[in-house]
């Protein structure tokens, strides 16, 4: 048993790191590996992750880590039985891949302006909270060219756009994103999609 | 809720040995490490050693050789004990629990106030 | 072993005033520093960890900054039930305290 692809971890930079790798062979991963984790530099205990299937040779394991500071950094040992496969280390403040986004809200009430909030998946005592910045990806249902993204470079949660931007009487969604400068990290995953018809009073023609 | 409850003698003769017994509640001895801390008005507080989740023990170099924790997770208990004693370690013993990664301590047991004299 | 130099020793201070506490490292500990109150005759209390996060159930007037070597403790207004002593600690290995900080009612 080897490893074919090594270790690559993330860290959501608040209690999960999630660590991925590839088995050179399909591998029951949860029942003959095991990787072990421990900060380094501190008085700590080594704890393990069971990891579970990705793929027919894929393994991937959530290490939980109940909070992050920019120093931290992990010692990984990959084992199968007695049989140490792989050794490695993890500074989760380098490798942050921050929460998705939540609660996407399309509000449409507010004269022919739609506002589009969401949450900040951070509570505000996290690092991340304030260092934040978004991607809202909008798109039409009906009509795949329909396609554009807009970028959120101020901390609040939220965008307004004129509904006369997008065609109306059609279907659009709607998803948002995040990113943090400061720590260079790479986007969050999508949040869930929310949908909503687009309609608006055309201006009245004056001759 | 969280209680960590500490028993042991008050009073031991120099040379002989302490062992404080601390009784866990509200959580599992297999989720959490046990420290104990010592006080004194002589040295302050002092750091012993810590039983961790998974058994495995990290004593202060200074008190290694005297010191032993284990535990039993069905009576969630923790035993501390402490050979040869002397005046100097007169002070007060806590087990404290430790939160989550960081060896910090959330919840501390009562102490157990220990005198050496003869 | 890493040192820690907690100052002042003893401060007095009223009721609504602002006080900080001091604590030095002798070596680079990163943000691994926590602090503790204690009241007399009773058990430490966490108050702050990773140098600035507040421990759960502490109020929002107590405040921990610093890293590398220097960090304080700030209480901002002070109430009554905040008099006694403080002590940082430091999580590398070996842990070890600081030699406290007694706040005492002016």
């Known amino acids: 048993m080897k490893v074919l692809q090594e270790p690559t971890c993330v860290s959501d930079y608040m209690s999960i790191s999630t660590c991925e790798w590839k088995m050179n062979g399909p591998t029951n991963c949860s029942t003959e590996l095991r990787l072990l984790y421990q900060l380094v530099f501190l008085l700590s205990e080594a704890h393990t992750c069971i990891p579970e299937n990705n793929g027919g040779a894929g393994c991937v394991c959530h290490l939980l880590m109940d909070d992050v500071v920019s120093a931290d950094n992990y010692t990984l040992d990959l084992w199968a039985g007695q049989q140490l496969l792989w050794k490695g280390s993890f500074k989760p403040s380098e490798h942050v891949k921050p929460r998705a986004p939540g609660n996407l809200t399309v509000h449409t009430n507010v004269s022919d302006t739609l506002l589009l909030t969401w949450s900040n998946p951070y509570p505000p005592d996290n690092y991340l909270y304030n260092h934040l910045t978004y991607a809202v990806n909008i798109w039409s249902e009906n009509d795949p060219a329909d396609f554009r993204i807009y970028n959120v470079t101020y901390l609040e949660p939220s965008l307004r756009i004129a509904a006369s931007t997008l065609k109306s009487g059609i279907s659009y969604r709607a998803r948002v994103r995040a990113w943090a400068q400061c720590y260079n990290t790479t986007w969050s995953e999508w949040s869930p999609s929310t949908k909503w018809h687009n309609s608006y009073r055309e201006p009245f023609e004056q001759h | 809720q969280v209680q960590l409850k500490q028993s042991g003698p008050g009073l031991v003769q120099p040379s002989q040995s302490l062992s404080v017994t601390c009784t866990v509640s509200g959580f599992s001895l297999t989720n959490y490490g046990v420290h104990w801390v010592r006080q004194s008005p002589g040295k302050g507080l002092e750091w012993l050693g810590v039983i961790w989740s998974g058994g495995s023990t990290d004593y202060n170099a200074a008190f290694k050789s005297r010191l032993s924790i284990s535990k039993d997770n069905s009576k969630s208990q923790v035993f501390f004990k402490m050979n040869s004693l002397q005046a100097d370690d007169t002070a007060i013993y806590y087990c404290a629990r430790n939160k989550g990664t960081r060896p910090v301590f959330d919840y501390w047991g009562q102490g157990t106030t220990l005198t050496v004299s003869s | 072993d890493i040192q820690m130099t907690q100052s002042p020793a003893s401060l007095s201070a009223s009721v609504g005033e602002t006080v900080t506490i001091t604590c030095r490292a002798s070596?680079?500990?990163?943000?691994?520093l926590a602090w503790y109150q204690q009241k007399q005759g009773k058990s430490p209390q966490l108050l702050v960890y990773n140098a600035k996060t507040l421990a759960e159930g502490v109020p929002s007037r107590f405040s921990g900054s610093g890293s590398g070597t220097q960090f304080s403790l700030k209480i901002n207004s002070l109430q009554p039930e905040d008099f006694g002593s403080y002590y940082c600690q430091h999580y590398v290995s070996p842990l070890t305290f600081g030699a406290g900080t007694k706040l005492e009612v002016k």
């Open positions: 070596e680079n500990i990163y943000s691994y």
